[in-house]
Interface confidence: low
Amino acid sequence: QRVPKEGQTFFQKPESCPSVPEGSLKLDLGIINANQRVPLSRNIERRSTSPWNYTVTWDPNRYPSEVVQAQCRHLGCVNAQGKEDIFMNSVPIQQETLVLRRKHQGCSVSFQLEKLLVTVGCTCVKPLIHHVH
């Protein structure tokens, strides 16, 4: 049995409610805490030893329509002198998330969950070295 966290409620459906087809739900696209912003460290994507660029991708048939993706700038990492060190690797940090895909069927519109791989930034790692015996 799962116990609700403080301030959280598990809703019990009243007996009188009509049944809903399995796997479907009513969706309110309003966002709770819509103005909450991630407190990003300033220019972290430029100051990193594995710097990256951001691209805002836009898809009108996806919710959210706007998704920010990062791309590593270099194959190697940047040293203290600002030179690329090819003996280290810049690699993307990726997060699998769920978005809603808008589907049009005749006059009706529905949404389906879709997995999206979001690159949130890059990190510097030691390269994989394959030892030949």
Partner: nanobody, 122 residues
Framework: EVQLVESGGGLVQPGGSLRLSCAAS??????MGWLRQAPGKEREFVAA????????YYADSVKGRFTISRDNSKNTLYLQMNSLRPEDTAVYYC?????????????????WGQGTLVTVSS
């Protein structure tokens, strides 16, 4: 590289209105913003809008008077300025952003236009 060209500035009396436009070359869905710089002052944030146009943010000093909007089909950003005051006098710039974090931080904008001068005076 995105090129931005602002237009629509000019001389207007207090209480008057102006509509600024910013034409962007090259299709962009980046978030965009309007910033301004008054003589002898630093650039300050005015308003910002998400790539889709769904989210907008305003500086407290312009809230309720200015409206930011965009037309992605025309690659154009707009700033409708009503009830103008003498303290709104400044060079207005449009610029792109990577996202809507810290919209008020002028250092986080890139691809600035050359600016358009707005003078509010009687």
């Amino acid at each position: 590289e995105v090129q931005l060209v602002e237009s629509g500035g000019g001389l207007v009396q207090p209480g008057g209105s102006l509509r600024l436009s910013c034409a962007a070359s090259g299709r962009t869905y980046d978030a965009m913003g309007w910033l301004r710089q008054a003589p002898g002052k630093e650039r300050e944030f005015v308003a910002a809008i998400s790539g889709s146009g769904d989210d907008t943010y305003y500086a407290d000093s312009v809230k309720g008077r200015f409206t930011i909007s965009r037309d992605n089909s025309k690659n154009t950003l707009y700033l409708q300025m009503n009830s103008l005051r003498p303290e709104d006098t400044a060079v207005y710039y449009c610029a792109t952003r990577r996202g809507l974090y810290y919209v008020w931080d002028a250092n986080d904008y890139e691809n600035w236009g050359q600016g358009t001068l707005v003078t509010v005076s009687s």
